[in-house]
Amino acid sequence: RTTTCFGDGCQNTASRCKNGGTWDGLKCQCPNLYYGELCEEVVSSIDIGPPETISAQMELTVTVTSVKFTEELKNHSSQEFQEFKQTFTEQMNIVYSGIPEYVGVNITKLRLGSVVVEHDVLLRTKYTPEYKTVLDNATEVVKEKITKVTTQQIMINDICSDMMCFNTTGTQVQNITVTQYDPEEDCRKMAKEYGDYFVVEYRDQKPYCISPCEPGFSVSKNCNLGKCQMSLSGPQCLCVTTETHWYSGETCNQGTQKSLVYGHHHHHH
């Protein structure tokens, strides 16, 4: 946020940039939280735009019995590994086809024991305030589906009739990691010393980090004809004086007609 300064007062202004503002020769360059000619004003809204999507990663192990392990499978650039990866990915795409959050699989390691496949199942969902529930549900469905397929697709008489066969007991979920996004925490952090006064409100499922000085939200402070200004003790209304009235009160809702006051003074003299 920048405010340009012209004229003789500029040099004077340079030394007066407040709140960590820096002079660039023309104006005070204000840090994120401030604006104004001298960076003296606190912004009333902070952009904490959420990521478009939130991801989750499930670390799984399955045992494939329809492929005999060879040393070449340890080498990720080998023809054998590449082919195994392709078939395994295709098989998992079929297994998880009904899960909208499913993105794909990533094999981390193949080891002996038939073929023990250590891999990640990748999930992603559009950000909404309910993203945790959505991803939690998706991870549960992943567990159900992999358990089902590794129970059903098994070798019979040492032969597999499916694309891949599995050892029923070799299926394990090691770990589930969900990208954390906490708008309230982000809002508090970015508002720094004003953190107690900034809140998150949602509009069209998008979070907005705002102070009561931001109009149009349920927490917005109505200063009537006055101006809302944030200070370390919270939002305050700065009341204005017009040609005909003085305004006062916590929300500048008390107007006093100047003529009455002047009239009273005049009468006094």
Epitope: K68, E80, C160, M164
Partner: nanobody, 124 residues
Framework: DVQLQASGGGVVQPGGSLRLSCAAS????????MAWFRQAPGKEREVVAF????????YYADSVKGRFTISHDNSKNTLYLQMNSLRAEDTAVYYC?????????????????WGQGTMVTVSS
């Protein structure tokens, strides 16, 4: 990439014999799987037999056991299918398939490399 070239099909009388060949190229290892599948008109593709080129395993469909023999010549990188005592129900397009893995599955979807088909007709 792996290339497969099948040949040897033809018309034969019931009880007769035929030998199919499939030349493979593009492998980086000398240990892999090769198979013969067949597809009769209006039917799904089915396995006939498969072999591991290291000699570790062979498999035959019940319908051809004792009549067909699968083999592989490592020096020529060629797969063979010796078909004896042929029957009318053996009439189909025969395909060779391959995998760089040692596969133990008869599902065609697990086999990534395919040759073009060669037609076998058993008819009197």
């Amino acid at each position: 990439d792996v290339q497969l070239q099948a040949s040897g099909g033809g018309v034969v009388q019931p009880g007769g014999s035929l030998r199919l060949s499939c030349a493979a190229s593009g492998y980086t290892s000398n240990r892999y799987s090769m198979a013969w599948f067949r597809q009769a008109p209006g039917k799904e593709r089915e396995v006939v037999a498969f072999i591991w080129t290291d000699g570790g395993r062979t498999y035959y469909a019940d319908s051809v056991k004792g009549r067909f023999t699968i083999s592989h010549d490592n020096s020529k990188n060629t797969l063979y299918l010796q078909m004896n005592s042929l029957r009318a129900e053996d009439t189909a397009v025969y395909y060779c398939a391959a995998s760089s893995l040692l596969l133990q599955t008869i599902n065609p979807r697990a086999w990534p490399y395919w040759g073009q088909g060669t037609m076998v007709t058993v008819s009197s």
